[in-house]
Interface confidence: low
């Protein structure tokens, strides 16, 4: 769920998601369209695709709450939950570490980017 994602991103990146990533660029936060603006935005576009795939499998991506552990800088998704919960955790883990990998190219100007100006082809999943 969204609470899981927020907590995980904060733990991995050290940034408050509400202040730094939701929204950011053309794909971070709810919805997304157009060409991603940078590597951080690509992380979110890929994450959107991950969620879209789970939706087609009938997973309730915003309501499903999964269990995980964060220790020594790594995320360990619990194998005790449902398939949907485990996959959701995997999607969120991937985006959290993707955002961390790209902290050095994070652009403050893309925070609250003007979505109507997100142009170009939206990448396929």
């Amino acid at each position: 769920g969204i609470l899981n994602l927020n907590k995980m991103v904060k733990q991995v990146t050290g940034k408050m998601p509400i202040l730094s990533y939701w929204p950011y660029g053309c794909h971070c936060g709810l919805g997304g369209r157009g060409q991603p603006k940078d590597a951080t935005d690509w992380c979110c576009q890929t994450h959107d695709c991950c969620y879209d795939h789970l939706k087609t499998q009938g997973c309730s991506i915003y309501k499903d709450y999964y269990r995980y552990n964060f220790s020594q800088g790594n995320i360990h998704c619990s194998d005790k939950g449902s398939w949907c919960e485990q996959q959701l955790c995997a999607c969120d883990k991937e985006v959290a570490f993707c955002l961390k990998r790209n902290l050095d190219t994070y652009q403050k100007r893309l925070r609250f980017y003007w979505r109507p100006h997100c142009r170009g082809q939206t990448p396929g999943c």
Epitope: L30, G31, K108, R109, R111, F112, Y113, W114, R115, P116
Partner: antibody
Framework: QVQLKESGPGLVQPSQTLSLTCTVS????????MQWVRQPPGKGLEWMGA???????QYNSILKSRLSISRDTSKSQVFLKMNSLQTEDTAIYFC???????WGQGVMVTVSS | DIQMTQSPASLSASLGETVTIECLAS??????LAWYQQKPGKSPQLLIY???SLQDGVPSRFSGSESGTQYSLEINSLQSEDAVTYFC?????????FGSGTKLEIK
């Protein structure tokens, strides 16, 4: 093309409730956030609140206790309700598409007995 | 709340001149600033977004820049139709706030 139009009463009695409608065309409310802004005669602009594309609502804390924003996506309409009106609420009320790339023409609301 | 201090409140310039309007944010707004033009009896029109990006259809004589928390709108080759009111606005966080406005007049 994109169009926004506000409608509502031009005159409201003090202590009464103001109800305004913003009717949009050329885009879907489920894809764009919508804002309400007001401007007292000869003065500056004040942001009142917004309803996000996902349905979440945010209010200016100064007005929060008196304000209600809602929408009907099937009718492409956004609504503003504000109660306990006083003469200082006299203003032109605008709806605008987030982030203010399109505005309605505004509706003048006078609070007077 | 983030305060936007706009200056000057009014200014007068001659046709063809360059004028600058400034807005000072009370804290870092990370380029999340827009400029609007408002003609009498009309709704505001977006000129500049993200501090320096020109909105579609806006003449290139309008430009925006920033330095720290100070944001500027520059109008080059002033024309008679530019003699209206200009507002800045941050969209960093809620509540969004506007500057108090600058009324531009032609000498």
């Amino acid at each position: 093309q994109v169009q926004l139009k506000e409608s509502g009463p031009g005159l409201v009695q003090p202590s009464q409730t103001l109800s305004l409608t913003c009717t949009v065309s050329g885009f879907a409310l489920t894809s764009y956030d919508m804002q309400w802004v007001r401007q007292p005669p000869g003065k500056g602009l004040e942001w009142m609140g917004a309803i996000w594309a996902n349905g979440n609502i945010q209010y200016n804390s100064i007005l929060k206790s008196r304000l209600s924003i809602s929408r009907d996506t099937s009718k492409s309409q956004v609504f503003l309700k504000m109660n306990s009106l006083q003469t200082e609420d006299t203003a032109i009320y605008f709806c605008a598409r987030f982030r203010f790339d399109y505005w309605g023409q505004g509706v003048m609301v006078t609070v007077s007995s | 709340d983030i305060q936007m201090t706009q200056s000057p409140a009014s200014l007068s310039a001659s046709l063809g001149e360059t004028v600058t309007i400034e807005c000072l944010a009370s804290e870092d707004i990370y380029s999340n600033l827009a400029w609007y033009q408002q003609k009498p009896g009309k709704s505001p029109q977006l000129l500049i977004y993200d501090a320096s990006s020109l909105q579609d259809g806006v003449p290139s004589r309008f430009s925006g820049s920033e330095s720290g928390t100070q944001y500027s709108l520059e109008i080059n080759s002033l024309q008679s139709e530019d003699a209206v009111t200009y507002f800045c606005q941050h969209h960093r966080d809620s509540p969004l706030t506007f500057g108090s406005g600058t009324k531009l007049e032609i000498k």
